[in-house]
């Protein structure tokens, strides 16, 4: 068990803060909830603190919850591949470039670390080149979320990881908006981190609303499990 992994044995409170600017539309989002890495479970509620969110909530899911991949469930035989927990409590910088097919792109930078007993994800987001009547600024996405696989590889040069995945957003007309994600994670601290073999995270997300919440918001339930590395031969002969 890495030193960082010991911090995730129980339920951990989560705080998310985002400052965004998409095509000049500025906004802020605050999120609160909790994570339980034993089950790879996240429950979070996000509120746009600046009024109406200028982009559809589903386009921010990866920035919020795929931001705290330290809550992913890594099975026992894969724990030595869990970069995310090993970087704690100092945390990691997580950066992404996200291209929305035939539309604009997001660039994000987040610092994910413990502040006291709380896991905090502080994010800056910049969106450019979006069409005002496109699927994103035109709010044509359905309020739901598909399951995805998130592919992880070591980046020894940066003492971190590179990640790639393609998100499929459902559009109201029945078609799909693709979003290509390019991600890099680097540790904030100088301590040793686990550099993984290639593997993936399997994610399932459910979006809902709080019937008592008047502000523009999103409620998110997510399960994330690491996979893609089989038991070694030594496991077979135990």
């Amino acid at each position: 068990m890495s030193k960082g992994e010991e911090l995730f044995t129980g339920v951990v409170p989560i705080l998310v803060e985002l400052d965004g600017d998409v095509n000049g539309h500025k906004f802020s989002v605050s999120g609160e909830g909790e994570g339980d890495a034993t089950y790879g479970k996240l429950t979070l509620k996000f509120i746009c603190t600046t009024g109406k969110l200028p982009v559809p909530w589903p386009t921010l899911v990866t920035t919020f919850s795929y931001g705290v991949q330290c809550f992913s469930r890594y099975p026992d035989h894969m724990k030595q591949h869990d970069f995310f927990k090993s970087a704690m409590p100092e945390g990691y910088v997580q950066e992404r470039t996200i291209f929305f097919k035939d539309d604009g792109n997001y660039k994000t930078r987040a610092e994910v670390k413990f502040e006291g007993d709380t896991l905090v994800n502080r994010i800056e987001l910049k969106g450019i080149d979006f069409k005002e009547d496109g699927n994103i600024l035109g709010h044509k996405l359905e309020y739901n979320y598909n399951s995805h696989n998130v592919y992880i590889m070591a980046d020894k040069q940066k003492n971190g990881i590179k990640v790639n995945f393609k998100i499929r957003h459902n559009i109201e007309d029945g078609s799909v908006q693709l979003a290509d994600h390019y991600q890099q994670n680097t540790p904030i601290g100088d301590g040793p981190v686990l550099l993984p073999d290639n593997h993936y995270l399997s994610t399932q997300s459910a979006l809902s609303k709080d019937p008592n919440e008047k502000r523009d918001h999103m409620v998110l339930l997510e399960f994330v499990t690491a996979a893609g590395i089989t038991h070694g031969m030594d496991e077979l002969y135990k």
């Epitope: 470039t97 660039k107 910049k126 450019i128 940066k158 590179k162 390019y182 890099q184």
Partner: antibody, heavy 120, light 106 residues
Framework: EVQLVESGGGLVQPGGSLRLSCAAS????????IHWVRQAPGKGLEWVAS????????SYADSVKGRFTISADTSKNTAYLQMNSLRAEDTAVYYC?????????????WGQGTLVTVSS | DIQMTQSPSSLSASVGDRVTITCRAS??????VAWYQQKPGKAPKLLIY???SLYSGVPSRFSGSRSGTDFTLTISSLQPEDFATYYC????????FGQGTKVEIK
Amino acid sequence: EVQLVESGGGLVQPGGSLRLSCAASGFNISYYSIHWVRQAPGKGLEWVASIYPYYSSTSYADSVKGRFTISADTSKNTAYLQMNSLRAEDTAVYYCARAGWVASSGMDYWGQGTLVTVSS
Amino acid sequence: DIQMTQSPSSLSASVGDRVTITCRASQSVSSAVAWYQQKPGKAPKLLIYSASSLYSGVPSRFSGSRSGTDFTLTISSLQPEDFATYYCQQSWGLITFGQGTKVEIK
């Protein structure tokens, strides 16, 4: 050893076309972004276009959008810049450069450059 | 587009001098700023990335810092091989470069 080698530059008339190539060695372009940056004679650096070959995601400077197309062939580990409807103001040395996947990476390796001259 | 206003456009200095070049972004660019050195007829070379991270193999006399939307490249003790043109570059929006600063021998 990481290397980027540009080719395809030359003299072309206004309205004409050229295709620049950027052959990469010593690394797999799929796991990086590739950028074209140009420098007009005696002037500063100007970004032209970028491609993320893993998913073929692209972006362009406003000055070339609709005229230039960036592409990549991962099997050949090569990026391309197709330049159409060339103008006199496109005259420059064109460099290809490698960067990481994210905004803070910086362009850590550059080619030697290839000169494009647009003149009648 | 995000503008990077670089100053000064040129400066004269002597070997051993401390040299400071600044870039101001027209809006927030997070830490997505890099600095390059270019010599005549050559391709640019990366010095600093992520506003303040020294690129591998670059001498430690080069450093970068950020204060909001102001970014600074400092050469603590100018060496003969440092006379060149320096550019800042942001990649938070569509990529843009500063106009360049030519460092000449006094």
